[in-house]
């Protein structure tokens, strides 16, 4: 069922030079070191599977230690075109160009890639995050200003012999990191061109990529401590479900979030947490080392399998969905924020999900693989899990079809 043995040559084995090439933490993103231009300018770049632009700070900003200086690069080419990217909160805008790009702790290649040079931004860069740009690893369909701007990974595969696959192991620390610790700590691995078997345990299970824009998948069932939420599975994917390393939380559609929180509250009812905790706003703290993980339930998401009527489930622990945070008043204690939140744009399987698993973005075969991460945080009683197969009928009905809004649908 896991289809591991049918991988083509070059897709298996060890990628020693790429292991441990990510740093960061779930709250502020994971970043990889990249170089741009000639001579090479080194920048830390956020790894984001939820967008498709390679964009870097290219002007001074209070939160940036360094930025891309196009005038110092002999290989920079101006595309004479602007780009503007608004978010729900914040935005960035810049100028498009191309330059030579490489990843020091990645494949030994240099490619000419599109770069958005960010000249202005609002609430985009994060103070103390230590990254200066973003690497959008999703598909051209969601690239800005339009799908004609080839994303970095497409350029990489087109210009080299690197297989069309990458995989991510994001390692949550399990405790808050101060500035020094965050810089010194290992954040995980981005394996470009294949799968590193040292980064996971057990089997890899694959779910189809429903459509190549975001990394869209289909959730067919949700359980809290083994109790089915019993919702129409379309609700779980309304209006889509995506795997997004650039988002911190597990984000759920409103109805699903409300049902999930109700169930998590019921399971952990020995304690009465303030409403602000369940809204993700308020910390809750325990005396150091006394966090009662056992009172919090596990969350299981069942994903459509590769075989008709077959699904598999991924299960995360409270160690993934309670995010360690610290402030000056609580430094002696263990404090957490609830990292499951409400979404109006569908399910987002962010870092809190990905930190439990080694996630394979097998673009060549239009599928995403999940296996238990060798670095996930757990306790002596429970561990994150990837299990299957399960029989699930009519899974195609779980996908939501977003109404088209282009001109063709407006014809009468």
């Amino acid at each position: 069922e896991t289809d591991e043995e049918s991988e083509e040559p070059g897709r298996r084995g060890s990628f020693v030079e790429m292991v441990d090439n990510l740093r960061g933490k779930s709250g502020q993103g994971y970043y990889v070191e990249m170089t741009v231009g000639s001579p090479p300018q080194t920048l830390n770049i956020l790894v984001d599977t939820g967008s498709s632009n390679f964009a870097v700070g290219a002007a001074p900003h209070p939160f940036l230690h360094r930025y891309y200086q196009r005038q110092l690069s002999s290989t920079y080419r101006d595309l004479r075109k602007g780009v503007y990217v608004p978010y729900t909160q914040g935005k960035w805008e810049g100028e498009l160009g191309t330059d030579l790009v490489s990843i020091p702790h990645g494949p030994n290649v240099t490619v000419r890639a599109n770069i958005a040079a960010i000249t202005e931004s609002d609430k985009f860069f994060i103070n103390g995050s230590n990254w200066e740009g973003i690497l959008g690893l999703a598909y051209a369909e969601i690239a800005r200003p339009d799908d004609s701007l080839e994303p970095f990974f497409d350029s990489l595969v087109k210009q080299t012999h690197i297989p069309n696959i990458f995989s991510l192991q994001l390692c949550g620390a399990g405790f808050p990191l101060n500035q020094t610790e965050a810089l010194a700590s290992v954040g995980g691995s981005m394996i470009i061109g294949g799968i590193d078997h040292s980064l996971y345990t057990g089997s890899l299970w694959y779910t189809p990529i429903r459509r190549e824009w975001y990394y869209e998948v289909i959730i067919v069932r949700v359980e809290i401590n083994g109790q089915d939420l019993k919702m129409d599975c379309k609700e779980y994917n309304y209006d889509k479900s995506i795997v997004d390393s650039g988002t911190t939380n597990l984000r759920l559609p409103k109805k699903v979030f409300e049902a999930a929180v109700k169930s998590i509250k019921a399971a952990s009812s020995t304690e009465k947490f303030p409403d602000g905790f369940w809204l993700g706003e308020q910390l809750v703290c325990w005396q150091a080392g006394t966090t009662p993980w056992n009172i919090f339930p596990v969350i299981s998401l069942y994903l459509m399998g590769e075989v008709t009527n077959q699904s598999f489930r991924i299960t995360i622990l409270p160690q993934q969905y309670l995010r360690p945070v610290e402030d000056v008043a609580t430094s002696q204690d263990d404090c957490y924020k609830f990292a499951v939140s409400q979404s109006s744009t569908g399910t987002v399987m962010g870092a809190v999900i990905m930190e439990g698993f080694y996630v394979v973005f097998d673009r060549a075969r239009k599928r995403i693989g999940f296996a238990v991460s060798a670095c996930h945080v757990h306790d002596e009683f429970r561990t994150a899990a990837v299990e299957g197969p399960f029989v699930t009928a009519d899974m195609e009905d779980c996908g939501y079809n977003i109404p088209q809004t282009d001109e063709s649908t407006l014809m009468t």
Partner: nanobody
């Protein structure tokens, strides 16, 4: 919704005094501790003084003998009496409370809340 209302900040000459107060409302849980922190421009936020629900107090070395913390449990209010103020006491002062959310409202589990801050300026 927990709300903290700070007051009493202002400008004063060195050697003068101020009394800060912080009133907490909007919750039914028990208060575990109340504290004052301060943050001067370009510096880290630091503990000034705290008082626990059993009445025990703690002070930063730099304010011992000059500042006194007290609480009015009936009003859920904490006070900071600041005497013999020095220019180095200039900072934004923040109220912090810990609310017990453990079994029966015990403090084995708590939720920390911050006020918006009140400015204290001491000129020489």
């Amino acid at each position: 919704q927990v709300q903290l209302q700070e007051s009493g900040g202002g400008s004063v000459q060195a050697g003068g005094f101020l009394r800060l107060s912080c009133a907490a409302s909007g919750y039914t849980y028990s208060t575990c501790s109340m504290a004052w922190y301060r943050q001067a421009p370009g510096k880290e936020r630091e503990l000034v003084s705290s008082i626990r629900n059993d009445g025990s107090t703690a002070y930063a070395d730099s304010v011992k003998g000059r500042f006194t913390i007290s609480q009015d449990n009936a009003k859920n209010t904490v006070y900071l009496q600041m005497n013999s103020l020095k220019p180095e006491d200039t900072a934004m002062y923040y109220c912090n409370i810990r609310i017990g959310v453990g079994p029966g409202g015990t403090c084995s589990i708590y939720a920390p809340y911050w006020g918006e801050g009140t400015q204290v300026t001491v000129s020489s």
